[in-house]
């Protein structure tokens, strides 16, 4: 296993709708053909995983039917947008990326991603 | 257990055609990317083809651009590389893949006249 640098975003504000983007880049040190990513979610020292992917390069990412996340890639670059947030789903989002083929095989973890999720306030009744 | 069967390779003149075709079993087939992957002698396992769960994306190696065309059938859990005006450089093993888990044990194609 070899190690690969990842970068993403410090801080990402959800939208209204609770859905958050953000990039995902790695610096590949040769030419993968098969890519895989994952997210993780860090709160309260907890790691769990939110969705993975794996691709093929210049083809779209594919996540399971039921995830919460959907993506594109471009390169080495991978757009991730995550639907359906809370409030409580604000944490740390942490993209990993795994080159699977060909060998050798390169493992990337980034930083994190701090996403905050703000419900909206709910619409105040109307007399009209 | 999991199966990748592939079938339909051979031997073909310049300029040819065959059609590859992977029948795949034991895990949920929909729900990968599959692949064509070649490894001619004395050479490196390369890429030729790859194609997303639902067919909407399908990506080429460079070498077999507007030449291979790959397809797949969700209802009938198979994957297919048509190959046309084949070439003696197309000589090679063809592997199918389910991205990134599972490979085929190959298929011979020899390209000559």
């Known amino acids: 296993c070899k190690a690969m640098h990842v970068a993403q975003p410090a801080v990402v504000l959800a939208s209204s709708r609770g859905i958050a983007s953000f990039v995902c880049e790695y610096a590949s040190p040769g030419k993968a053909t098969e890519v895989r990513v994952t997210v993780l979610r860090q709160a309260d020292s907890q790691v769990t995983e939110v969705c993975a992917a794996t691709y093929m390069m210049g083809n779209e990412l594919t996540f399971l039917d039921d995830s919460i996340c959907t993506g594109t890639s471009s390169g080495n670059q991978v757009n991730l947008t995550i639907q359906g947030l809370r409030a409580m789903d604000t944490g740390l989002y942490i993209c990993k990326v795994e080159l699977m083929y060909p060998p050798p095989y390169y493992l990337g973890i980034g930083n994190g991603t701090q996403i905050y999720v703000i419900d909206p306030e709910p619409c105040p009744d109307s007399d009209f | 257990q999991v199966q990748l069967v592939e079938s339909g390779g051979g031997l073909v003149q310049p300029g040819g055609s065959l059609t590859l075709s992977c029948a795949a079993s034991g895990f949920t087939f929909s729900s990968y990317t599959m692949a064509w992957y070649r490894q001619a002698p004395g050479k490196e396992r390369e890429v030729v083809a790859g194609i997303s769960r639902s067919g909407g994306t399908t990506n080429y190696g460079d070498s077999v651009k507007g030449r291979f065309t790959i397809s797949r059938d969700n209802a009938k859990n198979t994957v297919y590389l048509q190959m046309n005006s084949l070439k003696p450089e197309d000589t090679a093993v063809y592997y199918c893949?389910?991205?990134?888990?599972?490979w085929g044990q190959g298929t011979q194609v020899t390209v000559s006249s």
């Open positions: 893949r389910a991205v990134s888990d599972y």
